[in-house]
Structures are given as C-alpha cells and as structure tokens.
C-alpha cells in the first residue's frame, strides 16, 4: 500500500496472507472457515494461509496449508480479466474475534462509496520495502466511466476502479488478492495498477466481488 | 517479432511544430513504457520523455517541459510525439523506444528498466 | 538531475583486446536502474545490459556490467570487429539520463 497507514489492530480479521514458504505471496480474503478469496494471478501450486494477525511472520497466528484452488474459468492472463479464485484450506479455521469471515456482497456499491483496502505489499516504489504490519489506504469508488478515461480498453466489465483524486495512495506488488471493503462488504480484490505504483489519478484496479457471488458461492458448493 | 515502426521524416520551418507517430506490433502496447530519445548530428542520446501507454500518464524531461506533448492511441497501438515552437538546433533524430513494464500485476516487485526495443528514427530537420 | 559522466571520451583498441568503459554518477544509483547500450553510424541504440549487471536478450557473453553507487563498468572481454561502436550508460531516477557515449574505434 503507497501512502497508507497501518491499519487498526484486529480491524480486519477476515484478511489473510498468502505465503509462499514464509515470503509474502499475496493478499486474500476469508469468506468460509474453509475458503479463501483472492486474484487469480496469486494461482501457486500449494499455499501456506496465515490468519489472524496484522502481523507478517507473526509465530503466533494461525497458519494453514491449501492444496487446492479454483481460479475463474474466464480468467485471461493477458487481459487480467475475471481475476479471481477460491483457494480451499486442507482443514478448517478456528473462528475467533482475530479471524472472521467478511460479508459478501448483496448489490454492488455505487461510485463515490468511502472504501479502505488492506495489504502487506511494498510502501515504496520502485525500490521495494515490505511492511511488516497490515497497511489501509482509504480510498473511493470510481465510476467506470470515469475511470476507462485513464484505462481506456483494458478496463474490463467486471474491473473496479478506486483512488483519491490527486493522492499517491493506492496499492501495490503484494497487495493482490486482499480486499476492498465498503459499508463492512467485500467489493473488490486487488488486481493490477499502474506501475511504479502510486501516481495520483491513475485509480487502482479491483475485481468486482459484487459480480461474481454467484460463481463464489457455486464454487464452494461444489467442493465442499 | 516485436517491432516499433516510426513515420517518415520531416522538414519544418522554425516556429512550427512536429509531430512523429511510433506505431508497435508484436506485443501487448499498453503494457510497457514509449519513451522518445533524439539525437542532433554527431551528438549522445537525449532522453525528451515517455508516455505510460496504459493511462496516457506522461513524464517530460525539463527541457523539454512546455513544449513537447507525448499521446497515445491504443486502438492501434500508437505513440505520438509533437514538438512545439521549433528551432534549428532541434534538428536531429527521433527515436521512440519500448521502456519497462507500465503496470504491475501479480507478487513480483522487480522490473527491468532498460529501452529494449527501437524504432528506425525519424529524421527532423527545422531550417528557414 | 543525475548527471552520468562517460570515460575515455575514445578508446582506441585492437580486436581480441579487452575494453573497460566507465561511468560515474553525480549521485547515487540503483543498480536495478542502470542500463549500457551499444549504437553504429546510422542505427539505432541496442540494449545491451540492463540491471548493471543483467544482459539483455542475445547479448553475447564478452559483455558484462558491473558496479553499484556511483560507479559502473562495462566490460567487452574480447573485442570483435563489430563492437566497435559508441557506448552509452543510462539511468533512471524518476526521469531517465544519458551519459555522453564512449568511442570504441580501431587502433
């Protein structure tokens, strides 16, 4: 996250971190004691899933393996269209006020809703520097029509925009996947912005969760 | 292959302006930088700016602030670069060339920072 | 605005000679930012290494780069007929600079 803030202790105990032995892989979100949300992109061959601490590394929050995860099928590495994927822990959370599953989306937030979004990705750039602490930048819903002056075509149907007009904050490498929540639901996962991160005026880019919860829901059912 | 192809060159009178299309093909347009370099007679490079073509956001060199404007049209995948308020020591050779990766996407925070990629020039001569 | 500083200006040299060209910046460089390319009479640049160190995509492997701060090298280990050319250093730090280009010519 460029020019945010550290986020209040336990503000957000559906985020999760997505390791990749003990290495920041990704952000996500906890939608199930047995499911994980996050960007297609962040798609490894196993996952280690740390839960419940603001804290990268913490030797005291939950971790757990998944060996499984279920990327959209309409997901196009080439357009970042439907980025997003369900990853399914080997064994279930233990539900605690650290660790809750987030709301899912009943419609879709309009343009201008007040939203914070959340992640361990680098504070800096180009030079890279990973917090070790949960970073927030609160940011605001952009309309698509707003935002496709920026992007153009690479604007997807199902891409969400946010940022603050004039400001550097937004997110970064090793946000992907965590969440964008308003009015305490899910809206968006981190996808892809500009690079090097954080030039004001070019919003960051989300998954829009709001369109997807019937396939979240599906895909769980389906291997439950 | 890839490839950056550059429109033909030009002869302008002092006061006028310029402008040199850099059309790319091969690869994905909007996923990488368009820097413009010149280069007068028997001189180095000159870096003037560069364009992300995936926002339009653009980054002129001091000199050149004021004068030069860097656009894009995605839809067929070119870069436009129009100098202002010509002189004759603006003679040179413009080159476009295929900077870094413009947007970031996925867990990885190092890019590659080099012009890997030219256009053939475009020869600008500015005389009365 | 950083300021990179080529020397020599010319270096003149036999084939199967070893070249060492250097480039000094007015401020402190990443290496992740620092890039040689090579340019002939009438063609455009070519990448050679990017990263300081890094070289690009079919450079061959008399080339190399080095350094870090202030300080950086190219390195040609053996000089073929077609490397003589003009050298050039480039950095990046927010905008990018050039530095003013080595002649590698024929002794």
């Known amino acids: 996250i460029i020019d945010g803030y550290k986020c209040k202790e336990g503000s957000h105990p559906w985020q999760v971190a997505l390791l990749k032995g003990n290495q920041l892989h990704c952000g996500g979100v906890l939608v199930d004691k047995y499911w994980v949300l996050t960007a297609a992109h962040c798609k490894m061959g196993q996952y280690q899933v740390q839960l419940g601490s603001d804290k990268i590394g913490d030797q005291s929050a939950q971790k757990i393996k998944a060996t499984k995860s279920f990327r959209h099928p309409g997901y196009s590495t080439k357009t970042h269209v439907n980025d997003i994927m369900l990853v399914r822990l080997d064994e279930p959370v233990k539900m605690s006020s650290k660790v809750e599953a987030v709301q899912l989306p009943e419609h879709c937030e309009p343009p201008g809703t007040s939203c914070t979004v959340s992640g361990w990705g680098t504070t800096t750039s180009p030079d890279v520097t990973f917090p070790s602490d949960l970073m927030c930048s609160d940011v605001k819903l952009i309309s698509s029509r707003e935002c496709k002056k920026v992007y153009k075509d690479l604007l997807g149907k199902t891409m969400l925009c946010a940022g603050i007009p004039d400001s550097k904050t937004n997110t970064c490498n090793g946000d992907s996947g965590g969440p964008l929540v308003c009015n305490d639901t899910l809206q968006g996962l981190v996808s892809w912005g500009t690079y090097p991160c954080g030039q004001p005026n070019d919003p960051g880019v989300y998954t829009q969760v709001c369109k997807y919860k019937r396939w979240v829901m599906e895909t769980m059912k389906t291997h439950r | 292959q890839v490839q950056l192809v550059q429109s033909g060159a030009e002869v302008k009178k002092p006061g006028a302006s310029v402008k040199v299309s850099c059309k790319a093909s091969g690869y994905t347009f909007t996923g990488y930088y368009m820097h413009w370099v010149r280069q007068a007679p028997g001189q180095g490079l000159e870096w003037m700016g560069s364009i992300n073509p995936s926002s339009g956001g653009t980054n002129y060199a001091q000199k050149f602030q004021g004068r030069v404007t860097m656009t894009r049209d995605t839809s067929i995948s070119t870069a436009y670069m129009e100098l202002s308020r010509l002189r004759s020591d603006d003679t040179a050779v413009y080159y476009c060339?295929?900077?870094?990766?413009?947007?970031?996407?996925?867990?990885?925070?190092?890019?590659?920072?080099?012009?890997?990629?030219w256009g053939q020039g475009t020869t600008v001569t500015v005389s009365s | 605005e950083i300021v990179l500083t080529q020397s020599p200006g010319t270096l003149s040299l036999s084939p199967g000679e070893r070249a060492t060209l250097s480039c000094r910046a007015s401020q402190s460089v990443s290496s992740d930012y620092l890039a040689w390319y090579q340019q002939k009479p009438g063609q455009a640049p070519r990448l050679l290494i990017y990263g300081a160190s890094s070289r690009a995509t079919g450079i061959p492997d008399r080339f190399s780069g080095s350094g870090s701060g202030t300080d950086f090298t190219l390195t040609i280990s053996r000089l073929e007929p077609e490397d003589f050319a003009v050298y050039y250093c480039q950095q990046y730090a927010n905008l990018w600079t050039f530095g003013g280009g080595t002649k590698v010519e024929i002794k």
């Open positions: 060339a295929r900077g870094g990766p413009s947007t970031w996407y996925g867990g990885s925070a190092y890019y590659y920072y080099g012009m890997d990629v």
